[in-house]
């Protein structure tokens, strides 16, 4: 007898793990044999869908490899034309071990800003997310919170927040850990100790001290009156993210000195500045001929003659000392082109060292005059003819310019290195060379002869003077 379909085993909720098999059973009694169809969320499951297997005349639906998207309500409908169709429904709950779908990444953040370390998860039951910092579970506080999404939010990031983090997703089926990421907290450069202003006497040594901190550790640069410091020595040390810079200066003019601490945050820089003034106290007496300052020789004419990086005296009685003194040597230098090969190097050495006098520290940065012995060596040995001719022209008034008078020293007014070797400058080009002694011409003098000390002979010249030389 025909019999309307009856579902004898209604569908039940099925729990399945991802990638496992899930089976719904829909046992039907009827005659004739019913047609059984299956739907998921009211959408017909096609018989030829390879993800499913339908067996036992349609009474068994098997999902061959469960995906999380298979979640939903599955219904079977039986119909054999006798009576109405019957339906039974059941849910598929896809159970899933925790999975971290958006793991945290390394973060560099500036102190005081908000940091968010992402940690998006999947899983069923819904995983709970916690965080580990270093080796310990992270405790939430007023600045730190784990968001609904699982991400970690840190307000007003502080240096102590820096470290290694990982998120942990956990449900009844298991636990997932993210890889360890680094939170780096960068701190804007900040000056801890600003340089102090000084009021000093001309020629004093002053040390300006500047201490700064930041992450990364800042670099310190010094600026003098708006330009990079050209002289002075800088000593730096770094300890516990603090950089300490000391600028030692030989004070020959007042200045504004600025300490600039800089560090880099990605493509941007942060800087902190502090300035100090160095002023020069009034002297009790005028400086007379010593008005000027010491600086590295930056000219061209005397490059080969003066020692490399030599500090020379620049006379501020000229508006532009460097230019004026360079012009002075340049003018005289051109006239030396006509003198004898014996005289020329000696005269050039005398000229350059007379116009750009060597600087000496001690009292103040004063020019050291050329030693009398060297002046006389040029005058009476190397350039005797030329010197006479020049003095003659000067007496006859053929030299209208004061240039020549300024560029030729008066030997008798120069100190002797015999009486004080630190009172005057030597001309290395004329130093005594034991291998190639040349005797000075005899000189009439009531004073005893004086030894020129054996100084290292200069490789840049073959000139030498005899160790015995009369003084005037």
């Amino acid at each position: 007898l025909p019999k309307a379909p009856v579902i004898t085993t209604p569908l039940e909720t099925v729990d399945a793990l991802v990638e496992e098999v899930a089976t719904f059973m829909c046992a039907v009694e009827s005659y004739p044999q019913p047609e059984i169809s299956w739907t998921r969320n009211k959408i017909l499951i096609k018989l030829f869908d390879t993800r499913y297997s339908i067996r036992e005349n349609g009474q068994l639906l098997t999902i061959l490899s469960v995906e999380d998207s298979d979640d939903g309500i599955y219904c079977c409908t039986a119909n054999n034309g006798v009576g109405g169709a019957v339906e039974s429904c059941g849910a598929l709950q896809v159970k899933m071990k925790p999975k971290i779908t958006r793991p945290p990444i390394n973060v560099k953040i500036i102190e005081g800003l908000k940091a968010v370390l992402p940690c998006t998860t999947m899983g069923n039951p819904k995983p709970s997310v916690s965080w580990i910092k270093g080796d310990s579970p992270l405790r939430e506080n007023s600045r730190t919170a784990v968001l609904e999404s699982g991400s970690l939010r840190i307000h007003n990031v502080q240096k102590e927040d820096a470290g290694q983090y990982r998120c942990v997703a956990k449900n009844s089926l298991g636990t997932a850990y993210s890889k360890v990421v680094k939170l780096e907290v960068e701190v804007f450069a900040r000056i801890l100790r600003a340089p102090e202003s000084h009021n000093v006497t001309f020629g004093s040594f002053v040390t300006l001290h500047c201490t700064a901190t930041g992450i990364p550790v800042p670099t310190i640069t010094w600026i003098e009156n708006g330009n990079a410091v050209s002289s002075g020595s800088i000593q730096e040390s770094v300890k516990d993210r603090v950089i300490d810079s000391r600028l030692q200066l030989f004070i020959t003019k007042p200045g504004l000195y600025t300490c600039i601490a800089t560090n880099k945050h990605g493509e941007k820089f942060s800087t902190a500045k502090a300035a100090a003034t160095v002023s020069i106290a009034e002297w009790s007496k005028p400086q007379k001929d010593n008005k000027g300052y010491c600086a590295q020789y930056r000219g061209e004419v005397c490059n080969a003659v003066l020692a490399k990086d030599a500090l020379v005296f620049l006379n501020t009685s000229y508006a532009d000392p460097e230019e004026a003194q360079e012009l002075l040597v340049h003018t005289a230098w051109n006239e030396l082109k006509v003198v004898s090969p014996l005289c020329r190097p000696a005269a050039e050495a005398l000229l350059c060292n007379h116009v750009f006098q060597e600087c000496s520290p001690g009292v103040v940065p004063t020019p050291i005059p050329i030693c009398r012995e060297y002046c006389l060596a040029v005058k009476e040995l190397f350039c005797a003819k030329e010197w006479l001719a020049m003095e003659e022209k000067t007496h006859r008034g053929l030299y209208r310019s004061e240039m020549h008078l300024l560029s030729v020293p008066e030997c008798s007014k120069l100190p002797s290195m015999h009486w004080d070797p630190t009172a005057c400058a030597r001309l290395p080009h004329l130093d005594y060379n034991k291998e190639n002694p040349k005797t000075f011409p005899p000189m009439t003098s009531s004073k005893p002869s004086v030894d020129i000390p054996n100084l290292p002979s200069s490789s840049s010249s073959s000139f030498s003077v005899s160790p015995t030389y009369s003084m005037t």
Partner: antibody, heavy 115, light 111 residues
């Protein structure tokens, strides 16, 4: 030969004054820096003052405001005026030629400050 | 001011022995490629005498057994072969900045 001969030392009471002189010979005095250095009995050397070729003077802090250095290039003489003397100023006072090194020394003159 | 620390404070040596005296400056005395440090000898009852200037240049008339070395802040006076006439107190002095300062001295005695 360089000669530096100091004079003017003696016994003086605390608060008193003295004027030391140093006559230089054998070199062109005006072209050189001159110094005063002292040595207390059984003690080390103490630099006091220097005067440059333009008569600009510099002093150690211990004597600043009390001692005055000066020179007379015509007389080839270096001076040190000592005022407001203290017992700790008792020493042998040397006149010394030299710019940054102290090259030639006199024999010294003794200053004793005692009541 | 620059402080010069001399060591040792005294040393006893035999004739022919090598003697070294050290002088450490509280800051660099190097300026314009010269070290402004000098060494002096003061024999008993005599005025001091300059031995070495610019750290290593021997003053004329000083025996070549005396030599100076060092740079920036650390300096040494060496007597290569000590002689009885070298019994004295030795001082270092900086001429780098006023006030010029001396070390406290090293007394050199004969064994």
């Amino acid at each position: 030969e360089v000669q530096l001969v100091e004079s003017g030392g003696g016994l003086v009471q605390p608060g008193g004054s003295l004027s030391l002189s140093c006559v230089a010979s054998g070199f062109t005095f005006s072209l050189y820096y001159m110094n005063w250095v002292r040595q207390a009995p059984g003690k080390g050397l103490e630099w006091l003052s220097v005067i440059d070729t333009h008569s600009i003077a510099y002093y150690a802090d211990s004597v600043k405001g009390r001692f005055t250095i000066s020179r007379d290039n015509v007389k080839n003489t270096l001076y040190l005026q000592l005022n407001n003397l203290k017992p700790e100023d008792t020493a042998l006072y040397y006149c010394v030629l030299g710019r940054t090194a102290l090259v030639r020394w006199g024999q010294g003159t003794q200053v004793t400050v005692s009541s | 001011e620059i402080v010069l620390t001399q060591s040792p404070s005294s040393v006893t040596a035999s004739a022919g022995e090598k003697v070294t005296i050290n002088c450490k400056s509280s800051q660099s005395v190097l300026y314009n490629q010269k070290n402004y440090l000098a060494w002096y000898q003061q024999r008993p009852g005599q005025s001091p005498r300059l031995l070495i200037y610019w750290a290593s240049t021997r003053e004329s008339g000083v025996p070549d057994r005396f030599s100076g070395s060092g740079s920036t802040t650390d300096f040494t006076l060496t007597i290569s072969s000590f002689q009885p006439e070298d019994v004295a107190v030795y001082y270092c002095q900086q001429g780098y900045s006023v006030p010029y300062t001396f070390g406290s001295g090293t007394r050199l005695e004969i064994k």
